[in-house]
Amino acid sequence: AWELTILHTNDVHSRLEQTSEDSSKCVNASRCMGGVARLFTKVQQIRRAEPNVLLLDAGDQYQGTIWFTVYKGAEVAHFMNALRYDAMALGNHEFDNGVEGLIEPLLKEAKFPILSANIKAKGPLASQISGLYLPYKVLPVGDEVVGIVGYTSKETPFLSNPGTNLVFEDEITALQPEVDKLKTLNVNKIIALGHSGFEMDKLIAQKVRGVDVVVGGHSNTFLYTGNPPSKEVPAGKYPFIVTSDDGRKVPVVQAYAFGKYLGYLKIEFDERGNVISSHGNPILLNSSIPEDPSIKADINKWRIKLDNYSTQELGKTIVYLDGSSQSCRFRECNMGNLICDAMINNNLRHTDEMFWNHVSMCILNGGGIRSPIDERNNGTITWENLAAVLPFGGTFDLVQLKGSTLKKAFEHSVHRYGQSTGEFLQVGGIHVVYDLSRKPGDRVVKLDVLCTKCRVPSYDPLKMDEVYKVILPNFLANGGDGFQMIKDELLRHDSGDQDINVVSTYISKMKVIYPAVEGRIKFSTGSH
């Protein structure tokens, strides 16, 4: 028998520095977790102790903190090179700055192979990108070889900006011939490494003949065997075992997100490359693991530019940006409108001639808006200003919901109106009218939504049975502020871009902003 140790990360999302337990900015260093310096300590410890070790990343290193905003992927290549990653799969967020924003900082600078079997380049891009990422990579490990085959969510064109010259094929259809090719090369130990979410990971394990292990990402899935060491609740055991259609037991793993854990999986293979056994658990990278001093020093060196960036002007406002709780928790506020407009703008994807855009709606809990911005400072808006408005380090995500779920969400928005509670919704692409004289749960008297399948966008009444795409904070997608109906009833959830980054990009693009209160949220007469 031959033993392989797979160390894996996914959805690190720009958490190069250590973070607090909830993956936001580290405040009390003695309680902080993750970060590349701490990750390196643990990886090196395992490499020294065990003979056959691979360090793999399942995508979405890009996007999530000011590190990505400033360094645009150069930081990913630099620190992944330093940690000596063996391979990475492309995630949807690797395309956030377009194909050029992937090629120049990452594909050309990474010293490790970057993989995806289901992304095919066409047109002028084909020759430019040829060879910069691969469908698979064969890695020598000890006296053996291991094949790593990559895959990426086929939803990427709706979630990011890959442009028109990349085709995202069905994962299973694309993976099978590549695995077959590896078999013809006498590679009999094959890991599928990719970024399509836990459900697809399990399907790949079931359907793709010859895949021995699946290492996934995208869904931030936490798996654990035994008592979990932190706040994350396991979605299943680690590894999660899938019985393939040809009768094999295939381990599937994922390691939550944000570099908080290092996935640790030990696989035993027989001489024919069959998995005999698999066991392990994610390792919580808490403060009991010291940060590597040389990587930490490098982080501190790179940090300097971030501090300078946060005080630079992004754009100007010529109006007061009312982000006060007195406004945003009670009525339409122009800061809410600004943020929602930025959220929609960030999700413009012209992928179909029938639709002007795939999504037109935004909802945002008023309690998530934490500060106003005064225009009387020469109108200047900085990253620092926006960090005061959106201090939680969240993301603006894409969900699919039925109209009936949206109606429940808007009822929840005003179910205890008047108490300055955070669930009051700010909106974009939605016109809502409330009658507060009615009983809670029956206060929404009009709910119109902006059409997407139209050349001239207009507002139509919400249909209860129709499925709608909505952009909202991850906090709401996860049922925060009592929006349990969103969490329970959502049909799809894809994590999006860092909240501050979305708004800062929009302000930089617009240069001068003047958001108004324009009647998106109304109260019917006699009740307000």
Partner: nanobody, 126 residues
Amino acid sequence: EVQLVESGGGLVQAGGSLRLSCVVSGRTFSNYHMGWFRQAPGKEREFVAVIGRSGGPTYYADSVKGRFTISRDNAKNTVYLQMNSLKPEDTAVYYCAGDWRNSDSPSKLKPVYDYWGQGTQVTVSS
């Protein structure tokens, strides 16, 4: 676009010498482990020599040890194979290959190589 272009092949008498070159474009050359492989008519492609990305270590097939020398010039994006004391059994198409991997140990194993040139013919007459 990643491209590998070999040159320097030809017809030579037994006991003679040839120097093969392979120029790599499209990506930072110093990140590749570079190998030479050969394929004689009707035979499998086989390992000849390999050199690590920073100029070492080097490994050779037993059949060429002491006769062939692999080297690289990272400034010129080029890997060389100096072939001395050539024998008729060295007749083959010679391919250069690149292995993009974040490790200091080059590999002799053919499946590990992702990038291949078109090959250059070497014929050794007796």
